[in-house]
Interface confidence: medium
């Protein structure tokens, strides 16, 4: 489930409570979903430790703005060599996961300053069913989230060669893919520079004229003559990818808010969220407009906060 | 097209000496190897060294070759081929070869362009 | 090191006779062998590359076959002008050595 841009949270679907499944059949899913979760969390982690450690001295700080674009002109290059690269650019901005424990609730209001008032009142009394139970509310302690942009280039210049069989040695291997490469009958062209590497059997071919790659690059093979054997080995695109705008993000959360101390209840959790939703979008309780409400009676969820 | 040596002379043994190869009617490619190829009076041909006439220049030589004799190429048209510590034993008309590859059925397709060759005569 | 060893060393035979020299690799050579005829005096002439394929302009008598150690040049309705020294060459790429390159001594052919 998403809520608005700045500070979405996307909860796990559930089953539909109209879904009858049997014991043992659900006992199997849920067993299921938490090796899974155990799985991710400890990945989640892996790589929370890897950024942190990777990127603590690369953090910036850079607002990118949104900005709407319109398609006005096809551009007519001045020269060839504006054609030599086609590169293309993708924002990601990771979703940052968090685990709603037993007993507790994640509830998101759509307006900020009610979400800060419902903290700053911290303890809430709830009455679920014939229970008059007291929760507190928290900020939700998020951990880090990263954004990117993605740089691909696909060269018009180069290509990738591999499955490229050791059975050279290294400069003869350079000269017999040159070689290879060079031929107009197989879709070639001259050679400007072959980067082997023998350990992977792969190269990367670097044409003199545009347009080469491109005619190689129609057949996935090229062929490649060593001592009258035909080896065919294979072409594909040369890419570059960069990474730019590299930033690092962490906070709290302005409009969700973490709900404790239910651990004692052995309800529905759907019941348990309408109760919640019911009492919080009172003014006199605190609350206002609610956007989302989901809580963990059972296993933990895990709830993805977009930025 | 064609190919002609130059440098052939009379050395005294201990010397060195630059042989120079020039193409005409083509210029080097990834399609050739130039060549250096000897042969003494009445006797039969050496191969002596190929250099790769693309990029990468890449260099092969005959083992007793090795470090006393280099092949360098020097323009998209000439080839060298400088000797050191010269001896009789070295006295024979050096050809330039071209070898050309098709590629199509697998290595080795032969000289098929030669000089007229140059005599280099090492005598005291 | 790559040895070609060529046989025999002379040979005569008559005009419009038949001629055949033999040409042994050291190791396998995969029919990355040429064969040139040389006059005195004349550099080589490129006959017979890929141990078959005649070059252009080399007439069909001039016959190459063989592979692996074994490739023979074989010079059939001989004339006057086929007169020369014949040579065998190899060229092969290999994974541990140098680009090996090697001559046969070469074959003199004389026609009576």
């Known amino acids: 489930m998403e809520a608005d841009k700045d500070d979405t949270q996307q909860i796990l679907k559930e089953h539909s409570p109209d879904e009858f499944i049997k014991d043992e059949q659900n006992k199997g899913l849920i067993d299921e979903i938490t090796k899974k979760n155990i799985q991710l969390k400890k990945e989640i982690q892996k790589l929370e430790t890897e950024l942190q450690e990777a990127t603590k001295e690369f953090q910036i700080k850079e607002d990118i703005p949104e900005t709407k674009m319109k398609f006005l002109s096809v551009e007519t290059p001045e020269n060839d060599s504006q054609l030599s690269n086609i590169s293309c650019s993708f924002q990601v901005s990771s979703k940052v996961p968090y685990e709603i424990q037993k007993g507790q609730a994640l509830i998101t209001f759509e307006k900020e300053e009610v979400a800060q008032n419902v903290v700053s009142m911290s303890k809430h009394h709830v009455q679920i069913k014939d229970v008059n139970l007291e929760v507190t509310a928290k900020p939700v302690p998020l951990n880090s989230g990263v954004r990117f942009q993605v740089y691909v280039e696909v060269s018009k210049m180069k290509i990738n060669v591999t499955e490229i069989p050791d059975t050279l040695r290294e400069d003869q291997m350079r000269d017999k893919l040159e070689l290879s490469f060079s031929k107009s009958r197989n879709g070639g062209g001259e050679v400007d520079r072959v980067d082997y590497d023998r350990q992977s059997g792969s190269a990367v071919i670097t044409f003199v004229e545009i347009g080469v790659a491109d005619k190689i690059l129609k057949k996935k093979e090229y062929p490649l003559y060593i001592n009258q054997t035909c080896h065919r080995v294979t072409v594909s695109p040369y890419t570059e990818i960069h990474l730019k705008k590299y930033q690092i993000f962490s906070g709290t959360s302005k409009r969700t808010v973490l709900l404790t101390g239910m651990e004692g209840i052995q309800m529905d959790e759907e019941i348990v969220e309408d109760l919640i939703n019911i009492h919080f979008q009172r003014a006199k309780n605190g609350g206002g407009e609610v956007d989302v409400v989901k809580c963990s009676l059972g296993q933990p969820h895990i709830a993805y906060f977009e930025e | 097209q064609s190919l002609e040596e130059s440098g052939g002379d009379l050395v005294k043994p201990g010397a060195s000496l630059t042989l120079t190869c020039t193409a005409s009617g083509f210029s080097f490619s990834s399609s050739y190897y130039m060549c250096w190829v000897r042969q003494a009076p009445g006797k039969g041909l050496e191969w002596i060294a190929c250099i790769y006439a693309g990029s990468s220049g890449s260099t092969y030589y005959a083992s007793w070759a090795k470090g006393r004799f280099t092949i360098s190429k020097t323009s998209s048209t000439t080839v060298t081929l400088q000797m050191t510590s010269l001896t009789a034993a070295d006295t024979a008309t050096y050809f330039c070869?071209?070898?050309?590859?098709?590629?199509?059925?697998?290595?080795?397709?032969?000289?098929?362009?030669w000089g007229p060759g140059t005599l280099v005569t090492v005598s005291s | 090191a790559l040895v070609m060893t060529q046989t025999p060393s002379s040979v005569s035979a008559a005009v419009g006779g038949t001629v055949t020299i033999n040409c042994q690799a050291s190791q396998n050579i995969y029919t990355n062998l040429a064969w040139y005829q040389q006059k005195p005096g004349q550099p080589p002439k490129l006959l017979i590359y890929g141990a078959s394929n005649l070059e252009s302009g080399v007439p069909s008598r001039f016959k190459g076959s063989g592979s692996g150690t074994e490739y023979t040049l074989t010079i059939s309705d001989l004339e006057c002008d086929d007169a020369a020294t014949y040579y065998c060459q190899s060229r092969l790429y290999s994974r541990i050595a140098d680009r090996a390159n090697a001559f046969g001594g070469g074959t003199e052919v004389v026609v009576k």
């Open positions: 070869a071209r070898e050309y590859s098709y590629d199509d059925y697998g290595d080795f397709w032969g000289f098929n362009l």
